[in-house]
């Protein structure tokens, strides 16, 4: 807390400019009007303030806006955003995607901080759902964002947003998350033809049920082993040797290298040895 002191003569700030970097903390507190600061927030980032000076500026904004900053100020916070606590951010009402982008840019290249997580949570809750533009933005900054959401949170993702999801965005998703996302993807891509559909749905297949895998096996999709290994164990187990052979196509030979790994191992155990022998891979049930 900076002590309240009168501003020295001639030091009253008329605008936010570089001369302020020479002000001591108490001078900033006494000589910079909070309302002026709020209207000229866009200038703060161009000035090399110290962390201590930024603390003073934050304090002035906190006094001016005890109920939370308006979006016009939030959009121009820049590096001052790094000084905000999750508690500060919970008071905000951020509705503009441009504001969100501006603040994410400040944190770019770093892991998602509690501040960023709170900001995103406030933004998404304010919108009511995770729309395509928001998802596009968030996954651009944080490829793992989608997989950081709980299955309950993912349920608010509309199928139309699934078009924004790239394969790498799903890399760290667990089975429960894919269980939620797969039906949405199936709905989103339902009007595509066979081969195009498979290219789009492939990343989501970790949530596919047995009947969908059986259907895919009839479409000459040639699923690669990496995708097959991510399928749900309970979805793979009922597949016959013939269905797996059709599903994998030329990649079926890869089963040998994965025979000790789940779900291949569990699937092999459940097959008749005579059926496995038809693959000619030396798999032992």
């Amino acid at each position: 807390e900076v002590e309240k002191t009168a501003c020295p003569s001639g030091k009253k700030a008329r605008e936010i400019d570089e001369s302020l970097i020479f002000y001591k903390k108490w001078e900033l507190e006494a000589c910079v009007d909070a309302a002026l600061l709020a209207t000229q927030m866009d200038r703060v980032n161009a000035i090399p303030f110290t962390y201590e000076q930024l603390d003073v500026l934050k304090h002035k904004l906190d006094e001016l806006y005890p109920q939370g900053y308006p979006e016009s100020v939030i959009q121009h916070l820049g590096y001052l955003f790094l000084k905000m606590s999750p508690e500060d951010i919970r008071k905000w009402n951020v509705t503009s995607l441009e504001t969100l982008k501006a603040l994410l840019e400040v944190n770019k290249g770093h892991e998602m901080s509690p501040q960023v997580a709170t900001l995103i949570d406030r933004f998404v809750k304010g919108r009511g759902q995770l729309d395509k533009d928001t998802l596009d933005t968030l996954t651009a900054f944080y490829p793992g964002y989608l997989c950081s959401l709980s299955p309950e949170e993912l349920s608010s993702v509309p199928p139309s947003s699934i078009w924004a999801v790239r394969p790498q965005d799903l890399d760290t998703c667990d089975p429960r998350q894919l269980d939620v996302l797969y039906p949405k993807a199936r709905l989103a891509f339902q009007n595509m033809n066979g081969s195009e559909y498979f290219v789009k749905i492939q990343s989501f297949l970790g949530g596919a049920p047995t009947e969908d895998l059986k259907a895919l096996s009839q479409q000459n999709v040639s699923m690669d082993l990496a995708t097959f290994m991510k399928l749900r164990t309970d979805a793979v187990l009922p597949l016959t040797v013939a269905e797996v052979q059709k599903l994998l196509g030329p990649h079926v030979e890869g089963l040998k290298a994965e025979e000790r790994h789940r779900p291949v191992r569990d699937w092999i155990l459940r097959q008749r040895q005579d059926d496995l022998d038809t693959l000619g891979l030396g798999l032992q049930g």
Epitope: T233, D234, R260, R262, L269
Partner: antibody, heavy 119, light 107 residues
Amino acid sequence: QVQLQESGPGLVKPSETLSLTCTVSGGSVSSRDDLWSWIRQPPGKGLEWIGYIYYSGSTNYNPSLKSRVTISVDTSKNQFSLKLSSVTAADTAVYYCARDFVLSGFDIWGQGTMVTVSS
Amino acid sequence: DIQMTQSPSSLSASVGDRVTITCRASQSISSYLNWYQQKPGKAPKLLIYAASSLQSGVPSRFSGSGSGTDFTLTISSLQPEDFATYYCQQSYDASYTFGGGTKVEIK
């Protein structure tokens, strides 16, 4: 519901063979969704998986114990068994049998039986 | 064999604390990771399977996350009955392996 019960001698002499049996009640050892495992825990130490068996007789063992371990299944008695040969004091442990449900993990365990290797 | 490394090996916490235990696999194990709780003189009890699925009958304060090589068990608000040793276990490879355990003690 399914319950497991280990049985066998609590004391085995060095160089001899440790033999334990696990009796499955309330369920079938022939279930297609289950693997039946043996796991041990030396006093004051962590858990070590020994091996599993499927009702068909397919087995898989811990590579570090493979040369000394045999796990077998008797579907008529609803039991599976462990044999560990050439035991030493390092094999002294609580031995657990457990069901490995394919869609989860070791969801049902026996209460464990302490086996001491000593002359 | 796939090595499973748990950290910390022990921790002290108070009732009501949020506790996080991590488990790292020496290679990717997809989501084939289970968590167990063991109390002295008792058999282990399955808490979480497939990295994040809560076993039936386990309180919702327990949660799991992770995929690939890094996994986390979180107890959102530690209860007196939660003081125990926790183990992770991979079932991706046919040679199952456990982590070394994390003992959660009363502070």
